[in-house]
Interface confidence: low
């Protein structure tokens, strides 16, 4: 079991709440399943508190992962017959230690409540409960304490009093001939597996069975209503008698079913198929799953098993649910294959832990000064002038697309291309017609520019050529991405598909031009444009391209 911060719920601090060392306790409370869950109702079936609790120390600034929890079981002795249906309440309490703890010494961190169905002697059931920012992983099972046996722990079996026969007044206990049970006082014919009695001539049925002698299985359809029956009424079908019925594990071992048979998890000091062997030493090989045995040279000294990764328990007999730590990133599905963890990644992610985002620019190199561009769930290279192809590795002629308007001549240039305009035209792409009188230069309404006061487009008549990036209203947006963490710089990339922000500082060459920005009348002041995405903090810069001037020939 483990207790730690739940996924996607922020990162709660360690349980000690920055107030020095602390301990966690778990209080387990069992209530009858038939009663409505009420906070004040008693733990009528039993309650217990965890023991041998480790002390946690607060490390400033350190977030809590799953916490190492008390080793061993929380045992809740229940009273009377096991009802099969019950309410399970688990409370996580923090005890603050140390002189300067301040505030209350005890705090309830989390409380989970759930109604459960469970047959005694069955295998471990696993569960995960989330409450607030915490997540509790736990397993639970019900088993009978000798001399009780059966799915309700209502039949009594005594240890055999003689090698060959049962003691006076006792008869062999049906599932296990090595044990003896008190003679039945139930109604004659009452099913020994599915019925029990507390009074003479009575036959009370376990859940899943009905009829005067508890021999008729209940249809599972009665489970469809939410009624939770008592032991004697009809109810939902529980597993029938299984290999763990009566608990074949001796000396406090716990039984779990494995493909029609059973396995005993033995407490320290006991070993064997049914935990029947005691006085175990390391020579007996008590550590399962490759555990390393230390100590225990002679039967009187205890051995300790040091378990390999993935296993726990006094004999390394329990597999750790390594997937509960959610090692697979980006929504990957975790599979604990025994020898290794494997992650099955969602589309668009890859890597042993699905840590690589195939659709981002992190692993993409664009050659020859190209820039990686994300958008629409894919990525591409935006190549520098003069280069093309998927990775900008192919040479491209910047003049091939005939970018110069009105008969202008295109010249390849170290920083891109230059248009030499025909007489009567000027501009980056020769898009401006120059009036014959030389008074005004009227643009051929480039896209992105609002038709405004013609005086704003006055250009000196001596300039035959003006090259300035952004004349069409698209200043170059360079977005600098910083992932959380010191100095981790993923470099520069352009994001496509994002709405261009308004720019409040424009290149000098563009100061007299208005950018089209919705219905706005001019550049709005939004230098603080910074929308974090996926935990990135992004700074935006507007880079004016160099202006190139050339004289008319």
């Amino acid at each position: 079991h483990s207790f730690g911060p739940g996924p996607g719920l922020g990162t709660p601090r360690s349980p000690c709440n920055a107030r020095g060392p602390c301990r966690l306790f778990f209080r387990v409370c069992l209530k009858p399943g038939v009663s409505q869950e009420a906070t004040e109702s008693l733990c009528a079936l039993g309650a217990a508190l965890s023991t041998s609790v480790p002390v946690y120390t607060e490390h400033p600034g350190e977030s809590a992962a799953a916490l190492p929890l008390p080793d061993g079981l929380v045992r809740v002795p229940f009273r009377d017959a096991w009802p099969g249906t019950f309410s399970l309440v688990i409370e996580t309490w923090r005890e603050q230690l140390g002189e300067h703890a301040g505030g209350p010494a005890w705090n309830l961190l989390a409380r989970v409540v759930g109604r459960r169905r469970l047959a005694a002697g069955g295998p471990w059931a696993r569960d995960v409960q989330r409450t607030g920012t915490w997540e509790l992983h736990f397993s639970y099972r019900a088993r009978c304490e000798p001399p009780a046996v059966g799915a309700a722990c209502a039949r009594l079996c005594r240890s055999r009093s003689a090698p060959s026969r049962c003691g006076p007044g006792l008869r062999p206990c049906t599932p296990f001939p090595d044990e003896c049970e008190a003679p039945s006082v139930c109604r004659p014919g009452c099913s020994p597996e599915h019925g029990y009695c507390e009074e003479p001539d009575e036959c009370r049925c376990l859940e899943g069975w009905t009829g005067p002698l508890c021999t008729v299985p209940v249809s599972t359809s009665s489970c469809l209503n939410s009624r939770v029956p008592g032991p004697a009424s009809t109810g939902c079908l529980l597993p029938g008698p299984g290999p763990c019925d009566g608990n074949p594990c001796a000396n406090g071992g716990s039984c779990s079913e494995t493909s029609g048979s059973f396995e005993c998890a033995c407490p320290r000091g006991f070993y064997g198929l049914r935990c029947e062997v005691s006085g175990v030493t390391c020579a007996d090989g008590p550590c399962f799953n490759g555990g390393l045995c230390v100590g225990g040279e002679d039967p009187d000294s205890a051995y300790v098993c040091h378990c390999p990764p993935g296993f726990q328990g006094s004999n390394c007999e329990k597999r750790v649910d390594r997937c509960s730590l959610q090692p697979c990133q980006n929504g990957g599905l975790c599979l604990d294959l025994g020898h290794a963890l494997r992650c099955r990644c969602r589309a668009g992610f890859a890597g042993p832990r699905c840590e690589h985002d195939l659709d981002d620019c992190a692993g993409r190199a664009c050659a020859n000064g190209g820039t990686c561009v994300e958008g629409g769930g894919s990525r591409r290279c935006s190549c520098a002038l003069g280069f093309g192809g998927r990775d900008c590795r192919e040479r491209a002629d910047p003049c091939a697309s005939r970018p110069c308007a009105h008969g202008g001549r295109c010249y390849a240039h170290f920083s891109g291309l230059v248009c030499a305009c025909a007489p009567g035209y000027m501009g980056v792409r020769c898009e401006f017609a120059v009036r014959p009188d030389g008074a005004d230069a009227v643009p051929a309404a480039p896209r992105g520019l609002r038709q405004a006061d013609p005086q704003r487009f006055l250009l000196p008549p001596a300039l035959g050529l003006l090259v300035a990036a952004g004349l069409a209203g698209a200043a170059l947006l360079v977005i600098h991405v910083r992932r959380r963490g010191p100095g981790q710089d993923t470099g520069t990339r352009l994001l496509s598909g994002t709405r261009e922000p308004s720019v409040h500082t424009l290149p000098d060459a563009l100061n007299n031009l208005r950018l089209q920005d919705g219905a706005g009348d001019g550049p709005s002041s939004s230098a603080d444009w910074n929308h974090p995405e996926d935990g990135d903090s992004r700074s935006i810069y507007v880079i004016p391209a160099p202006s190139i001037y050339a004289r008319e020939a």
């Epitope: 025994g338 020898h339 290794a340 992610f349 890859a350």
Partner: antibody, heavy 118, light 107 residues
């Protein structure tokens, strides 16, 4: 020893469905995932999907999504692959293969030949 | 999907020859590549996992190498029982994909 035993050969008509079973023995069934792979005559192996035998969660290859259903019965230690809307190009040998601890498929079933013919 | 391109598609070599089969991934697959041997009419058998780890029981003449996008299966001394088709497979990213296979014959 680890064994994967598949159901016998099937002959189906186009548009029908086929369900192939794969019974595992010699290991704890729920500790290892199960792959389904097919091989058309003279073609490369083609991964169809896999099932997490512990949780029952299947994952399918895009090429088969909507047509394939992978399930399991833990009490019988058996995995199943059902392919619907069969067409002639689905004629192939279908394999189940256990997902090993460090490898995509360490033990393979003997294969089930499915022939789709009108 | 990640494409696995295997070459050659077939080869013929003499007993004792060193045989090399290559597999190229369309993008990096780290070292998550396995190699399988399939004899005529039989099921595939795992030879190599994690690009270079020989599976238990596989003869030492089989070895694997590579990481990222380029992987190689080498048979150091070809034996008659090695006549089979060899496949590479990536399990780095779903869907897992196989190479087209290399058919190895004895001259």
């Amino acid at each position: 020893q680890v064994q994967l035993v598949q159901s016998g050969a099937e002959v189906k008509k186009p548009g029908a469905s086929v369900k192939v079973s794969c019974k595992a023995s010699g290991y704890t069934f729920t500790n290892y995932g199960m792959n389904w792979v097919r091989q058309a005559p003279g073609q490369r192996l083609e991964w169809m999907g896999w099932i997490n035998t512990y949780t029952g969660d299947p994952t399918y290859a895009d090429d088969f999504k909507g047509r394939v259903t992978i399930t399991r019965d833990t009490s019988a230690s058996t995995a199943y692959m059902e392919l619907s809307s069969l067409r002639s190009e689905d004629t192939a040998v279908y394999y189940c293969a256990r997902i090993g601890g460090n490898s995509p498929s360490d033990y393979w079933g003997q294969g089930t030949t499915v022939t789709v013919s009108s | 999907d990640i494409q696995m391109t295997q070459s050659p598609s077939s080869l013929s070599a003499s007993v004792g020859d060193r045989v090399t089969i290559t597999c190229k991934a369309s993008q990096s697959v780290s070292n998550d590549v396995a190699w399988y041997q399939q004899k005529p009419g039989k099921v595939p058998k795992l030879l190599i996992y994690y690009a270079s780890n020989r599976y238990s029981g596989v003869p030492s003449r089989f070895s694997g190498s590579g990481s990222g996008t380029d992987f190689t299966l080498t048979i150091s001394s070809l034996q008659p029982e090695d006549v089979a088709t060899y496949f590479c497979q990536q399990d780095y990213s779903s869907p897992w994909t196989f190479g087209g296979g290399t058919k190895v014959e004895i001259k």
